[in-house]
Amino acid sequence: YPNASPLLGSSWGGLIHLYTATARNSYHLQIHKNGHVDGAPHQTIYSALMIRSEDAGFVVITGVMSRRYLCMDFRGNIFGSHYFDPENCRFQHQTLENGYDVYHSPQYHFLVSLGRAKRAFLPGMNPPPYSQFLSRRNEIPLIHFNTPIPRRHTRSAEDDSERDPLNVLKPRARMTPAPASCSQELPSAEDNSPMASDPLGVVRGGRVNTHAGGTGPEGCRPFAKFI
């Protein structure tokens, strides 16, 4: 089973999407060009993220298309900012025992959430599902990101960084077992979704991880086939 965490080393090159999930639905965190942050039921170019891990479990999350950092204000509101403020734009990442990831501000202690309520993170707590995230590899064709290629100066035309300025073409993968109590491969949610209705294949599937099991902070949230 792929690793629950999107943090595959100190600077993982691949694009990922963070999404919340219940038994029936899921929302992908997206950072819009105007800095607004919300959730979408499917992968979008604005939900494609790069997550850089730093020391002591801190992470920096960036929206690739908006070119904005995910940040949080003192009230717990999340927003995208072009300016990186270490106090507001770094989050503590923690993987819960159910295999889901939570992100909270070390400065203000609020959880990153797609719900509207602002809740402080407390060790051992069982956050609501819209504050717990899983990660999924990007499935949107890179052409949709329309990233301008920088002008070449002295570098060779074969230079990888020239052809792939965002370093997204060759994401590294790491396979580790999910918690034993949680590991359960689930059917793809595309089973009942014909390609005709999703030609880009951006709505479901390609999950980096799936978990199932009991409820509560010690167990795993019910995780049926969501759409």
Epitope: P129, N192, T215
Partner: antibody, heavy 117, light 106 residues
Framework: QVQLVQSGAEVKKPGASVKVSCKAS????????MHWVRQAPGQGLEWMGI????????SNAQKFQGRVTMTRDTSTSTVYMELSSLRSEDTAVYYC??????????WGQGTMVTVSS | AIQLTQSPSSLSASVGDRVTITCRAS??????LVWYQQKPGKAPKLLIY???SLESGVPSRFSGSGSGTDFTLTISSLQPEDFATYYC????????FGPGTKVDIK
Amino acid sequence: QVQLVQSGAEVKKPGASVKVSCKASGYTFTNHYMHWVRQAPGQGLEWMGIINPISGSTSNAQKFQGRVTMTRDTSTSTVYMELSSLRSEDTAVYYCARDAVDAFDFWGQGTMVTVSS
Amino acid sequence: AIQLTQSPSSLSASVGDRVTITCRASQGISSALVWYQQKPGKAPKLLIYDASSLESGVPSRFSGSGSGTDFTLTISSLQPEDFATYYCQQMYDDFNFGPGTKVDIK
């Protein structure tokens, strides 16, 4: 402002099917799941199912498996709920409701479906 | 599936009364609980989300509390327009509703 406008009341015979529509406006249609909830006369609210607005994928409550079909038309920002093999117990008001991640924040006005021979 | 129970199923109260309605989940649902108000012939109206957050435009006399399995909706001073049926709903693993509590005039 967000609005969900449903189709008018229907009277159907047992065994027939009914198709109720819900037209959304005032927001980006593909950014929110849509739900269907029904309420029999004098009874409580009963969740029926959910549709993903961009893929058309659906997930229904066990009770309605095989009898309910939810579809959507993104060009008109409309979702549809068709219930087949109607019986008298299906007499109810049917609501569409928008998913706001942490609640159903906007509801249609409801469509009364009466099943009677 | 997680089941929700509400108590009481109905209650009679007077204008100005403090009213408390409880909702209990069969398993822990964190704070993923919602309260709605419904009046006859109308669609439900969102009051409280995430167990305790007041929806925009809802009077402050409404409040919610609880986490895990036990939740409460409180109306601090009942007003004439508050006579209605109140439903809880969980957003944790499914979207089922409680059976409702009818608040009528004493």
